[in-house]
Protein backbone atom coordinates (compact mmCIF):
# COMPACT_ATOMS: atom_id res chain seq x y z
CA UNK A 1 0.00 0.00 0.00
CA UNK A 2 1.22 3.77 -0.74
CA UNK A 3 -0.20 4.77 2.65
CA UNK A 4 2.46 6.18 4.57
CA UNK A 5 2.15 5.85 8.17
CA UNK A 6 4.12 6.28 11.16
CA UNK A 7 4.91 2.77 13.84
CA UNK A 8 2.76 1.95 15.69
CA UNK A 9 1.99 -1.11 18.03
CA UNK A 10 0.20 -3.57 16.90
CA UNK A 11 -0.47 -6.27 19.70
CA UNK A 12 -0.42 -4.23 22.90
CA UNK A 13 -2.05 -7.34 25.33
CA UNK A 14 1.93 -8.53 24.44
CA UNK A 15 3.47 -5.57 26.10
CA UNK A 16 1.19 -4.96 29.50
CA UNK A 17 3.50 -7.18 31.73
CA UNK A 18 6.27 -4.46 32.28
CA UNK A 19 8.04 -5.92 35.55
CA UNK A 20 9.75 -9.80 34.27
CA UNK A 21 10.88 -10.62 37.66
CA UNK A 22 12.92 -13.89 36.11
CA UNK A 23 14.76 -16.18 38.33
CA UNK A 24 18.75 -16.56 37.55
CA UNK A 25 19.24 -19.03 35.06
CA UNK A 26 15.74 -18.66 32.86
CA UNK A 27 15.25 -17.50 29.40
CA UNK A 28 13.85 -13.81 28.84
CA UNK A 29 11.70 -12.68 25.81
CA UNK A 30 10.43 -9.19 25.46
CA UNK A 31 7.93 -8.47 22.97
CA UNK A 32 7.42 -4.87 20.96
CA UNK A 33 4.93 -6.17 17.95
CA UNK A 34 4.67 -2.70 15.41
CA UNK A 35 3.74 -2.12 12.60
CA UNK A 36 4.18 1.00 9.70
CA UNK A 37 4.92 1.84 6.75
CA UNK A 38 7.28 1.69 5.47
CA UNK A 39 7.73 -1.18 7.58
CA UNK A 40 9.79 0.00 10.59
CA UNK A 41 13.12 -0.84 12.17
CA UNK A 42 13.53 -2.06 15.85
CA UNK A 43 16.61 -1.56 18.02
CA UNK A 44 17.44 -2.07 21.96
CA UNK A 45 18.31 0.06 24.59
CA UNK A 46 19.97 -1.33 28.10
CA UNK A 47 19.02 1.33 30.54
CA UNK A 48 18.79 4.43 28.00
CA UNK A 49 21.46 3.31 26.28
CA UNK A 50 22.70 1.30 23.06
CA UNK A 51 22.60 -2.64 24.05
CA UNK A 52 25.43 -4.39 22.45
CA UNK A 53 26.21 -8.07 22.03
CA UNK A 54 29.59 -7.43 24.32
CA UNK A 55 27.47 -6.34 26.97
CA UNK A 56 26.35 -9.70 28.10
CA UNK A 57 28.07 -13.19 27.87
CA UNK A 58 26.58 -15.17 25.35
CA UNK A 59 24.79 -12.21 23.90
CA UNK A 60 21.75 -12.10 22.84
CA UNK A 61 19.08 -12.79 20.32
CA UNK A 62 16.85 -10.25 18.12
CA UNK A 63 13.90 -11.87 16.15
CA UNK A 64 12.94 -9.06 14.16
CA UNK A 65 10.06 -11.26 12.09
CA UNK A 66 8.71 -11.58 16.05
CA UNK A 67 9.70 -8.20 17.60
CA UNK A 68 11.89 -9.54 19.84
CA UNK A 69 14.35 -9.54 22.15
CA UNK A 70 15.79 -13.54 23.69
CA UNK A 71 18.16 -13.21 26.69
CA UNK A 72 19.13 -16.96 27.90
CA UNK A 73 20.62 -18.18 31.01
CA UNK A 74 19.96 -14.61 32.95
CA UNK A 75 22.25 -13.30 35.70
CA UNK A 76 22.10 -10.46 38.21
CA UNK A 77 23.90 -8.63 35.82
CA UNK A 78 21.26 -8.64 33.47
CA UNK A 79 19.06 -6.15 35.84
CA UNK A 80 17.63 -3.54 34.18
CA UNK A 81 15.53 -1.19 31.80
CA UNK A 82 14.99 -2.75 28.55
CA UNK A 83 13.63 -0.24 25.84
CA UNK A 84 12.68 -1.26 22.39
CA UNK A 85 13.13 1.90 20.17
CA UNK A 86 10.75 1.02 17.07
CA UNK A 87 11.55 3.65 13.79
CA UNK A 88 10.98 4.35 10.62
CA UNK A 89 10.95 7.77 8.04
CA UNK A 90 7.84 8.76 9.40
CA UNK A 91 8.33 8.00 13.48
CA UNK A 92 9.74 6.76 16.11
CA UNK A 93 7.99 4.43 19.46
CA UNK A 94 9.08 2.94 22.54
CA UNK A 95 8.16 1.00 25.35
CA UNK A 96 10.15 0.01 28.50
CA UNK A 97 10.43 -3.49 30.49
CA UNK A 98 12.00 -3.73 33.52
CA UNK A 99 13.96 -7.39 33.95
CA UNK A 100 14.43 -8.50 37.68
CA UNK A 101 16.50 -11.22 38.32
CA UNK A 102 15.46 -13.13 41.31
CA UNK A 103 18.14 -15.73 43.08
CA UNK A 104 16.30 -16.20 46.32
CA UNK A 105 14.91 -19.52 46.86
CA UNK A 106 11.57 -20.22 44.79
CA UNK A 107 8.88 -21.44 46.49
CA UNK A 108 5.31 -23.32 46.40
CA UNK A 109 3.11 -20.68 45.56
CA UNK A 110 1.83 -18.44 48.57
CA UNK A 111 -1.59 -17.21 48.76
CA UNK A 112 -2.79 -14.33 51.14
CA UNK A 113 -4.36 -15.74 54.65
CA UNK A 114 -8.18 -15.31 54.78
CA UNK A 115 -8.50 -14.65 50.58
CA UNK A 116 -10.71 -15.64 49.25
CA UNK A 117 -13.31 -15.13 52.17
CA UNK A 118 -16.75 -16.88 52.57
CA UNK A 119 -19.46 -15.00 51.27
CA UNK A 120 -22.90 -14.87 51.27
CA UNK A 121 -25.46 -13.03 49.03
CA UNK A 122 -29.91 -13.47 47.75
CA UNK A 123 -30.59 -14.55 44.72
CA UNK A 124 -29.98 -12.35 41.49
CA UNK A 125 -27.31 -11.06 43.37
CA UNK A 126 -23.58 -10.72 42.33
CA UNK A 127 -20.16 -11.91 44.52
CA UNK A 128 -16.39 -11.69 43.86
CA UNK A 129 -14.08 -13.82 45.07
CA UNK A 130 -10.60 -12.56 45.79
CA UNK A 131 -7.42 -14.29 45.74
CA UNK A 132 -4.05 -13.03 45.72
CA UNK A 133 -0.58 -15.06 44.93
CA UNK A 134 2.40 -14.77 45.77
CA UNK A 135 5.42 -16.75 44.16
CA UNK A 136 9.01 -16.22 42.96
CA UNK A 137 8.54 -18.29 39.55
CA UNK A 138 5.54 -17.12 37.46
CA UNK A 139 2.34 -19.34 38.53
CA UNK A 140 -0.45 -21.21 36.94
CA UNK A 141 -3.75 -20.05 38.94
CA UNK A 142 -7.05 -21.57 38.56
CA UNK A 143 -10.78 -21.20 40.20
CA UNK A 144 -12.21 -24.33 40.66
CA UNK A 145 -15.94 -24.98 42.18
CA UNK A 146 -16.75 -28.29 43.28
CA UNK A 147 -19.69 -29.74 41.71
CA UNK A 148 -22.09 -32.47 42.34
CA UNK A 149 -22.89 -35.40 40.10
CA UNK A 150 -25.99 -37.48 40.30
CA UNK A 151 -26.11 -35.93 43.46
CA UNK A 152 -22.92 -37.12 44.67
CA UNK A 153 -19.68 -34.94 45.41
CA UNK A 154 -17.42 -37.69 44.79
CA UNK A 155 -17.02 -40.00 42.13
CA UNK A 156 -16.40 -43.94 42.73
CA UNK A 157 -12.91 -43.73 43.26
CA UNK A 158 -13.01 -41.04 46.33
CA UNK A 159 -11.89 -37.55 44.82
CA UNK A 160 -14.28 -34.89 44.03
CA UNK A 161 -16.29 -33.46 41.22
CA UNK A 162 -14.44 -30.19 40.18
CA UNK A 163 -14.93 -27.84 37.74
CA UNK A 164 -12.60 -25.16 36.30
CA UNK A 165 -14.22 -22.13 36.10
CA UNK A 166 -11.17 -20.03 35.14
CA UNK A 167 -7.81 -20.57 34.00
CA UNK A 168 -4.70 -18.28 33.51
CA UNK A 169 -4.66 -18.33 29.43
CA UNK A 170 -2.89 -16.47 26.94
CA UNK A 171 -5.50 -13.47 26.99
CA UNK A 172 -6.05 -13.01 30.84
CA UNK A 173 -3.76 -11.04 32.62
CA UNK A 174 -2.11 -11.81 36.55
CA UNK A 175 -5.02 -9.63 37.59
CA UNK A 176 -8.18 -10.30 36.21
CA UNK A 177 -7.28 -14.24 37.40
CA UNK A 178 -6.92 -13.24 40.94
CA UNK A 179 -10.59 -11.99 40.86
CA UNK A 180 -13.87 -14.53 40.12
CA UNK A 181 -17.04 -12.66 39.43
CA UNK A 182 -19.94 -14.68 39.71
CA UNK A 183 -23.08 -12.25 38.45
CA UNK A 184 -26.98 -12.78 39.20
CA UNK A 185 -26.39 -15.61 41.67
CA UNK A 186 -28.43 -19.00 41.29
CA UNK A 187 -29.24 -21.22 44.53
CA UNK A 188 -26.58 -23.63 42.45
CA UNK A 189 -24.13 -21.62 42.86
CA UNK A 190 -23.62 -22.00 45.99
CA UNK A 191 -20.96 -24.51 47.49
CA UNK A 192 -16.83 -24.55 47.62
CA UNK A 193 -14.81 -22.35 45.65
CA UNK A 194 -11.03 -23.10 45.65
CA UNK A 195 -8.30 -21.02 44.24
CA UNK A 196 -5.20 -22.89 42.85
CA UNK A 197 -2.12 -21.65 42.11
CA UNK A 198 0.68 -23.84 40.90
CA UNK A 199 4.05 -23.38 40.09
CA UNK A 200 7.36 -25.89 39.37
CA UNK A 201 7.69 -25.87 42.95
CA UNK A 202 4.25 -27.55 43.71
CA UNK A 203 0.54 -26.10 44.64
CA UNK A 204 -0.95 -24.28 47.10
CA UNK A 205 -5.03 -23.79 47.07
CA UNK A 206 -7.55 -21.59 49.80
CA UNK A 207 -11.09 -22.40 49.51
CA UNK A 208 -13.82 -20.30 50.48
CA UNK A 209 -17.89 -21.05 50.85
CA UNK A 210 -20.70 -19.18 49.19
CA UNK A 211 -24.03 -19.23 51.17
CA UNK A 212 -26.92 -17.93 48.37
CA UNK A 213 -29.86 -16.65 50.15
CA UNK A 214 -33.81 -16.17 49.17
CA UNK A 215 -34.55 -12.70 47.62
CA UNK A 216 -36.21 -10.62 50.62
CA UNK A 217 -40.14 -10.74 49.78
CA UNK A 218 -39.71 -14.21 48.02
CA UNK A 219 -40.42 -17.81 48.82
CA UNK A 220 -37.01 -19.84 48.28
CA UNK A 221 -37.78 -21.12 44.53
CA UNK A 222 -37.83 -25.01 44.34
CA UNK A 223 -35.44 -25.70 41.31
CA UNK A 224 -34.92 -28.55 39.37
CA UNK A 225 -32.06 -30.39 39.34
CA UNK A 226 -29.24 -28.66 37.15
CA UNK A 227 -27.16 -30.11 34.31
CA UNK A 228 -23.69 -31.45 36.00
CA UNK A 229 -20.70 -30.94 34.55
CA UNK A 230 -17.87 -33.68 34.95
CA UNK B 1 1.18 -47.57 33.86
CA UNK B 2 2.96 -44.42 34.95
CA UNK B 3 6.67 -44.53 34.26
CA UNK B 4 9.97 -43.17 33.90
CA UNK B 5 12.74 -44.40 32.24
CA UNK B 6 16.27 -42.77 32.43
CA UNK B 7 18.99 -42.99 29.78
CA UNK B 8 22.58 -41.86 28.48
CA UNK B 9 24.52 -42.75 32.16
CA UNK B 10 27.86 -43.66 30.90
CA UNK B 11 31.75 -43.23 32.16
CA UNK B 12 32.92 -40.01 31.24
CA UNK B 13 36.46 -38.27 31.59
CA UNK B 14 36.66 -34.90 33.86
CA UNK B 15 35.95 -31.39 32.13
CA UNK B 16 33.29 -33.46 29.08
CA UNK B 17 29.98 -33.56 28.75
CA UNK B 18 27.18 -35.92 28.49
CA UNK B 19 23.47 -35.97 28.16
CA UNK B 20 20.76 -38.08 29.92
CA UNK B 21 17.19 -38.59 28.93
CA UNK B 22 14.29 -39.80 30.57
CA UNK B 23 10.97 -41.22 28.58
CA UNK B 24 7.75 -40.50 30.35
CA UNK B 25 4.76 -42.68 29.78
CA UNK B 26 1.36 -43.38 31.48
CA UNK B 27 0.71 -39.26 32.03
CA UNK B 28 0.19 -36.22 30.69
CA UNK B 29 3.96 -34.76 30.97
CA UNK B 30 3.08 -31.56 29.54
CA UNK B 31 1.22 -30.69 32.91
CA UNK B 32 3.90 -31.69 35.23
CA UNK B 33 6.99 -29.97 36.68
CA UNK B 34 9.82 -32.55 36.31
CA UNK B 35 13.21 -32.88 38.58
CA UNK B 36 16.18 -34.53 37.83
CA UNK B 37 17.97 -36.09 41.66
CA UNK B 38 20.85 -37.93 42.08
CA UNK B 39 22.96 -40.40 44.53
CA UNK B 40 26.29 -40.97 45.08
CA UNK B 41 27.47 -44.25 45.50
CA UNK B 42 26.67 -45.50 48.96
CA UNK B 43 25.72 -41.58 49.93
CA UNK B 44 22.27 -39.89 50.36
CA UNK B 45 19.97 -37.70 47.77
CA UNK B 46 20.87 -34.83 46.55
CA UNK B 47 18.27 -32.42 44.48
CA UNK B 48 19.62 -31.30 41.18
CA UNK B 49 17.43 -29.23 39.11
CA UNK B 50 13.59 -28.74 38.23
CA UNK B 51 12.05 -27.62 35.09
CA UNK B 52 8.49 -26.15 34.98
CA UNK B 53 5.64 -28.20 33.19
CA UNK B 54 6.11 -25.84 30.20
CA UNK B 55 9.80 -25.38 30.43
CA UNK B 56 9.69 -21.65 30.93
CA UNK B 57 11.13 -21.52 34.22
CA UNK B 58 13.98 -23.81 35.18
CA UNK B 59 16.11 -24.09 39.22
CA UNK B 60 19.56 -25.85 39.53
CA UNK B 61 21.45 -26.47 42.76
CA UNK B 62 24.14 -24.35 43.21
CA UNK B 63 26.57 -27.26 42.87
CA UNK B 64 25.55 -28.20 39.21
CA UNK B 65 24.76 -24.16 38.50
CA UNK B 66 26.49 -22.86 34.95
CA UNK B 67 27.44 -26.71 34.18
CA UNK B 68 23.94 -28.70 34.14
CA UNK B 69 21.04 -27.57 31.91
CA UNK B 70 17.41 -29.20 32.14
CA UNK B 71 15.08 -28.79 29.17
CA UNK B 72 12.53 -30.28 27.87
CA UNK B 73 10.61 -31.60 24.83
CA UNK B 74 6.44 -32.00 25.64
CA UNK B 75 6.24 -33.09 21.85
CA UNK B 76 8.30 -36.33 22.63
CA UNK B 77 7.30 -36.72 26.62
CA UNK B 78 11.28 -36.37 27.11
CA UNK B 79 13.05 -34.53 29.89
CA UNK B 80 16.80 -34.23 29.42
CA UNK B 81 20.15 -32.91 31.29
CA UNK B 82 22.67 -31.33 29.98
CA UNK B 83 25.90 -31.66 32.07
CA UNK B 84 29.31 -29.98 30.83
CA UNK B 85 32.14 -29.67 32.40
CA UNK B 86 31.92 -33.06 34.30
CA UNK B 87 33.56 -33.33 37.95
CA UNK B 88 33.98 -36.70 40.05
CA UNK B 89 32.49 -35.22 42.18
CA UNK B 90 29.22 -35.81 39.79
CA UNK B 91 29.24 -39.35 39.77
CA UNK B 92 26.23 -40.56 41.06
CA UNK B 93 22.60 -42.24 39.98
CA UNK B 94 20.69 -39.59 38.08
CA UNK B 95 16.88 -40.18 38.79
CA UNK B 96 14.01 -38.82 36.95
CA UNK B 97 11.20 -37.24 39.69
CA UNK B 98 7.87 -36.48 38.34
CA UNK B 99 6.78 -32.96 40.13
CA UNK B 100 3.68 -30.84 40.66
CA UNK B 101 1.13 -31.12 38.11
CA UNK B 102 -0.88 -28.22 36.81
CA UNK B 103 -4.35 -28.57 38.82
CA UNK B 104 -6.00 -29.44 41.79
CA UNK B 105 -5.04 -33.01 43.36
CA UNK B 106 -5.94 -35.30 46.32
CA UNK B 107 -3.02 -36.96 46.64
CA UNK B 108 0.64 -35.63 46.86
CA UNK B 109 1.66 -33.04 43.89
CA UNK B 110 4.76 -34.67 43.00
CA UNK B 111 7.56 -36.07 43.77
CA UNK B 112 5.60 -39.87 43.91
CA UNK B 113 7.20 -41.31 40.80
CA UNK B 114 10.78 -41.89 40.32
CA UNK B 115 12.68 -43.40 37.63
CA UNK B 116 15.15 -46.44 37.93
CA UNK B 117 17.59 -44.17 37.71
CA UNK B 118 21.08 -44.20 35.24
CA UNK B 119 24.19 -44.42 36.13
CA UNK B 120 26.91 -41.80 35.19
CA UNK B 121 31.02 -42.35 36.03
CA UNK B 122 33.37 -38.99 35.85
CA UNK B 123 36.48 -40.61 36.13
CA UNK B 124 40.27 -40.53 34.25
CA UNK C 1 18.60 -23.88 51.94
CA UNK C 2 16.84 -25.29 54.43
CA UNK C 3 18.79 -28.56 56.29
CA UNK C 4 17.22 -31.84 57.28
CA UNK C 5 19.20 -33.69 59.89
CA UNK C 6 17.75 -37.27 60.64
CA UNK C 7 18.59 -39.90 63.79
CA UNK C 8 19.35 -42.18 64.56
CA UNK C 9 22.28 -43.09 61.16
CA UNK C 10 21.29 -46.57 61.78
CA UNK C 11 18.47 -48.72 63.38
CA UNK C 12 18.38 -52.46 64.58
CA UNK C 13 14.66 -54.05 64.89
CA UNK C 14 13.39 -57.28 66.21
CA UNK C 15 10.43 -58.54 63.46
CA UNK C 16 7.29 -57.30 64.85
CA UNK C 17 8.62 -54.59 67.22
CA UNK C 18 8.32 -50.40 66.32
CA UNK C 19 10.58 -48.45 65.18
CA UNK C 20 10.52 -44.62 65.28
CA UNK C 21 13.00 -42.08 63.08
CA UNK C 22 13.28 -38.63 64.23
CA UNK C 23 13.71 -35.63 60.89
CA UNK C 24 13.92 -32.24 62.11
CA UNK C 25 14.25 -28.81 59.85
CA UNK C 26 16.47 -25.82 60.20
CA UNK C 27 12.93 -24.25 58.94
CA UNK C 28 9.15 -24.50 59.41
CA UNK C 29 7.67 -26.51 57.17
CA UNK C 30 4.19 -25.40 57.60
CA UNK C 31 3.09 -23.35 54.75
CA UNK C 32 0.59 -20.46 54.56
CA UNK C 33 -2.16 -23.03 52.99
CA UNK C 34 -2.52 -25.01 56.56
CA UNK C 35 -0.03 -27.98 54.90
CA UNK C 36 3.39 -29.48 55.86
CA UNK C 37 5.53 -30.04 53.71
CA UNK C 38 7.41 -33.45 54.51
CA UNK C 39 7.57 -36.16 52.77
CA UNK C 40 9.13 -39.38 53.65
CA UNK C 41 10.66 -42.35 51.26
CA UNK C 42 11.52 -45.79 52.03
CA UNK C 43 14.74 -46.93 49.82
CA UNK C 44 14.94 -50.67 49.24
CA UNK C 45 18.53 -51.96 47.97
CA UNK C 46 18.96 -51.58 44.06
CA UNK C 47 16.22 -49.34 43.78
CA UNK C 48 14.85 -45.83 43.28
CA UNK C 49 13.38 -44.47 46.64
CA UNK C 50 9.78 -45.00 46.94
CA UNK C 51 7.28 -42.24 48.27
CA UNK C 52 5.80 -43.62 52.09
CA UNK C 53 4.30 -40.51 53.62
CA UNK C 54 3.41 -36.81 52.37
CA UNK C 55 2.38 -34.03 53.96
CA UNK C 56 3.61 -34.81 57.26
CA UNK C 57 1.02 -37.50 57.84
CA UNK C 58 -0.80 -38.66 54.60
CA UNK C 59 0.01 -42.47 53.87
CA UNK C 60 0.54 -42.57 49.95
CA UNK C 61 -1.23 -45.48 48.02
CA UNK C 62 -0.44 -48.52 48.56
CA UNK C 63 1.55 -48.16 52.00
CA UNK C 64 0.62 -50.18 54.82
CA UNK C 65 -1.32 -48.57 57.85
CA UNK C 66 1.66 -49.87 60.20
CA UNK C 67 3.54 -46.62 58.93
CA UNK C 68 2.91 -43.04 60.38
CA UNK C 69 4.02 -39.83 60.13
CA UNK C 70 3.87 -37.02 62.53
CA UNK C 71 5.43 -34.07 63.99
CA UNK C 72 4.61 -30.06 64.09
CA UNK C 73 6.57 -26.98 61.92
CA UNK C 74 10.63 -28.52 62.30
CA UNK C 75 10.20 -31.89 64.42
CA UNK C 76 8.69 -34.94 62.75
CA UNK C 77 8.67 -38.73 63.66
CA UNK C 78 8.11 -41.68 60.96
CA UNK C 79 6.66 -44.75 63.05
CA UNK C 80 7.07 -48.21 62.25
CA UNK C 81 4.35 -49.84 64.60
CA UNK C 82 5.68 -53.34 63.86
CA UNK C 83 8.38 -53.77 61.95
CA UNK C 84 8.38 -56.90 59.22
CA UNK C 85 11.43 -57.78 56.92
CA UNK C 86 10.47 -56.18 54.06
CA UNK C 87 10.90 -53.13 55.78
CA UNK C 88 14.51 -52.90 55.68
CA UNK C 89 16.25 -49.89 53.80
CA UNK C 90 17.20 -46.22 54.01
CA UNK C 91 14.51 -44.21 54.88
CA UNK C 92 14.71 -40.59 53.85
CA UNK C 93 12.69 -37.74 54.58
CA UNK C 94 12.42 -34.71 52.36
CA UNK C 95 11.48 -30.83 52.85
CA UNK C 96 9.19 -29.81 49.57
CA UNK C 97 8.57 -26.28 50.59
CA UNK C 98 11.34 -24.38 48.91
CA UNK C 99 14.21 -25.26 46.51
CA UNK C 100 16.61 -26.37 46.92
CA UNK C 101 14.54 -29.53 47.71
CA UNK C 102 16.27 -31.03 50.44
CA UNK C 103 16.59 -34.54 52.24
CA UNK C 104 17.85 -36.01 55.80
CA UNK C 105 21.04 -38.04 55.38
CA UNK C 106 18.67 -41.12 55.99
CA UNK C 107 18.27 -43.74 58.46
CA UNK C 108 19.32 -47.24 57.15
CA UNK C 109 17.21 -49.86 59.28
CA UNK C 110 17.95 -53.83 59.11
CA UNK C 111 16.10 -56.55 60.74
CA UNK C 112 17.74 -58.04 63.77
Known amino acids: SNNKRAPYWTNTEKMEKRLHAVPAANTVKFRCPAGGNPMPTMRWLKNGKEFKQEHRIGGYKVRNQHWSLIMESVVPSDKGNYTCVVENEYGSINHTYHLDVVERSPHRPILQAGLPANASTVVGGDVEFVCKVYSDAQPHIQWIKHVEKNGSKYGPDGLPYLKVLKAAGVNTTDKEIEVLYIRNVTFEDAGEYTCLAGNSIGISFHSAWLTVLPAPGREKEITASPDYLE | EVQLLESGGGVVQPGRSLRLSCAASGFTFSSYAMHWVRQAPGKGLEWVAVISYDGSNKYYADSVKGRFTISRDNSKNTLSLQMNSLRVEDTAIYYCVRGAGRGYTYGPDGFDIWGQGTMVTVSS | DIVMTQTPLSLSVTPGQPASISCTSS???????????LYWYLQKPGQPPQLLIY???NRFSGVPDRFSGSGSRTDFTLKISRVEAEDVGVYYCMQYIEAPLTFGGGTKVEIK
Open chain 3, 27 to 37: RSLLHSDGKTY
Open chain 3, 55 to 57: ELS
